[in-house]
């Protein structure tokens, strides 16, 4: 009935109300400068100021500049929108050690865990990665008797541990000397490692191996089956896929039943010393040279003890190789030496914090 | 600052069990890469490790002890705790707890160690 | 289980003195070591971790070496505050286990 429809000029000649055709009602006119948060609004909190790109509007109803995330250390977790900020994350292979609003003022490569040592958290871009001791043939899990009724999440497979070269490992984020503590925050819960149950609450002396699977029937397929990151080699072991967990490295090729995982530098980086399906050292494409830290009193004695070298003393390069090869066991404290005449010179200690300078590169941070 | 205080029975006969409460301060188990161990040692000997209990409450024991070892936490109030069953002689030990540090989260030892409680095993 | 042995239960030592202590681990565990200072009565005290970084504020005369099964901590030059028990402890694997300790007398 037309007399039931409102006055589409005046909406019964209320002037703070516009007739939209469209959704055939009247709707609330938003004054000069406020622009609607809906199609239809209808009331004066369905208005809002409009604030220039790259601009949010915060509690206050300020206009408020987004975060920028253009450092090379973050990148962006969430858009930048009308009501809320653009919310930056450390990148991938690094921690936040400490935090700024809808950002971090401090990013640090994830720790490398020492030869030896097992992943217990891999790191995520808020904490760091935590290591711990490998269990030989037995399972980590298995604390006290009602622990090992069942498979426990946290239980990751056993093999002999690999040397590992920390030539990167330039990212525990402990200074070695002065004690700064990093901001608590760079240190609750991290995500689990990778679960691998079957491991769990029985010794074996083929680590990785799941107890054999019945032939499916009419099959040939009766192969060995290993654990969830191990292959089937050539002599029919069960053997662990290389890790590929190292900041300087990628993956390559997945680990596949009867094939390890294999492992290559990350792209800006090349390797200077291989290893089997990896790289123990990878450094940064194109190398100069880099400035090594030592104790003078310590020169001349074989049994140096590494301290953080003081802030400056890193240029903004990585250490060449020495002579182009390492050994791939080099040990965790000797693994960057640089080939010189004095006693042992560590250019980044592995408990030096090494954050990203503007250019990308590592830095050491002495904390 | 860090401050970690065991307490537990002092004596006890062969069989009992013991139980033991570290209550710390200063620092939380909340935190990640955050734990506690119990690590014992016998009057004049060296330490023995017992038990680790994770930030998680995932917990590691050693082999030899571990059909006697219980090992568990209470996160809001500061406290990890120890049980040992069946106890002999050979228990007869000071007991520590001292806390794996979480920003030296890549190696394991302990930073700060409380004074430790004595525990005699005796008929 | 991996064995720490430090063979010198005792040593004597002076002040001023530079003294060695060792330890042997009965399999490679890396550089995964770090060394404790116990004095009597009390509870011990880190010193060195990773077999050569200094814990922070232990003073720089004591230093740390080694990787593999042979570890050293050298005190270059020996204080009186120096004389307690010094024990190693490897992290490579579980058990964590410790040496059974040397102990630094005076002469």
């Known amino acids: 009935f037309p007399q039931d429809r409102p006055f589409e000029d005046t909406c019964h000649g209320n002037p703070s109300h516009y007739y939209d055709k469209a959704v055939r009602r009247c709707c609330y006119r938003c004054p000069m400068g406020l622009f609607p948060t809906q199609q239809c609004p209808q009331r004066p909190t369905d208005c809002r100021k409009q604030c220039e790109p790259d601009y949010y509007l915060d509690e206050a109803d300020r206009c408020t500049a987004c975060v920028t995330c253009s450092r090379d250390d973050l990148v962006e977790k969430t858009p930048c929108a009308w009501n809320s900020s653009r919310v930056c994350e450390c990148r991938p292979g690094m921690f936040c050690s400490t935090s700024a609003v809808n950002s971090c003022a401090r990013c640090f490569f994830h720790s490398v865990c020492p030869a030896g040592m097992i992943v217990k958290f891999p790191g995520t871009a808020q904490k760091n990665t935590v290591c711990e001791p490998a269990s030989p043939g037995v399972s980590p899990a298995c604390a006290s008797p009602e622990n090992c009724k069942e498979p426990s999440s946290g239980t990751i497979p056993q093999a002999k541990p690999t040397p590992v070269s920390p030539a990167t490992s330039s990212a525990s984020t402990m200074p070695v000397r002065g004690g700064t503590r990093l901001a608590q925050e760079a240190a609750s819960k991290l995500t689990r490692a990778p679960d691998s149950p079957s491991s769990v609450g029985r010794p074996s002396s083929d680590p990785g191996l799941s107890p054999t699977q019945p032939c499916p029937e009419g099959s040939g397929d009766c192969r060995k089956q290993c654990e969830p990151d191990y292959y089937l080699d050539e002599a029919g072991r069960c053997t662990a896929c290389v890790s590929c967990s190292r900041d300087d490295l990628v993956e390559k090729t997945p680990c596949a039943w009867n094939s390890s995982r294999t492992c290559e530098c990350r792209p800006g980086m090349i390797c200077a010393t291989s290893a089997t399906n990896s790289c123990a050292r990878c450094v940064p494409y194109p190398i100069c040279a880099a400035e090594t830290v030592t104790k003078p009193q310590d020169m001349a004695e074989k049994d140096t003890t590494f301290e953080a070298p003081p802030l400056g003393t890193q240029p903004d390069c990585n250490p060449t190789p020495e002579n182009g090869e390492a050994p791939a066991s080099t040990s965790p404290t000797q693994s960057l030496l640089v080939d010189s005449q004095a006693s042992k010179t560590l250019p980044i200690p592995t408990s030096a914090p090494v954050a990203l300078s503007s250019t990308g590169k590592p830095v050491l941070d002495a904390g | 600052q860090v401050t970690l205080k065991e307490s537990g029975p002092g004596i006890l006969q062969p069989s009992q069990t013991l139980s033991l409460t570290c209550s710390f301060s200063g620092f939380s188990l909340s935190v990640s890469g955050m734990g506690v161990s119990w690590i014992r040692q016998p009057s004049g000997k060296g330490l023995e490790w017992l038990a680790h209990i994770h930030w998680d409450d995932d917990r590691r024991s050693n082999p030899s002890l571990r059909s006697r070892l219980t090992i568990s936490k209470d996160t809001s109030n500061n406290q990890v705790f120890l049980k040992i069953t069946s106890v002999d002689t050979a228990d007869t030990a000071t007991y520590y707890c001292a806390r794996r540090p979480d920003l030296y989260g890549n190696y394991f030892f302990f930073d700060f160690w409380g004074q430790g409680t004595t525990l005699t095993v005796s008929s | 289980d991996i064995v720490m042995t430090q063979s010198q239960k005792f040593m004597s030592t002076s002040v001023g003195d530079r003294v060695s202590v060792t330890c042997k681990a009965s399999?490679?565990?890396?550089?995964?070591v770090a060394w404790y200072q116990q004095k009597l009565g009390q509870s011990p005290k880190p010193l060195i971790y990773s077999a050569s970084y200094r814990y922070s504020g232990v003073p720089d005369r004591f230093t740390g070496s080694g990787s593999g099964t042979d570890f050293t901590l050298t005190i270059s030059d020996v204080q009186s505050e120096d004389l307690a028990e010094y024990f190693c402890?490897?992290?490579?694997?579980?058990?964590?286990?410790f040496g059974a300790g040397t102990k630094l007398e005076l002469k």
């Open positions: 399999q490679n565990v890396f550089t995964n």
């Open positions: 402890q490897q992290y490579n694997s579980y058990p964590v286990t």
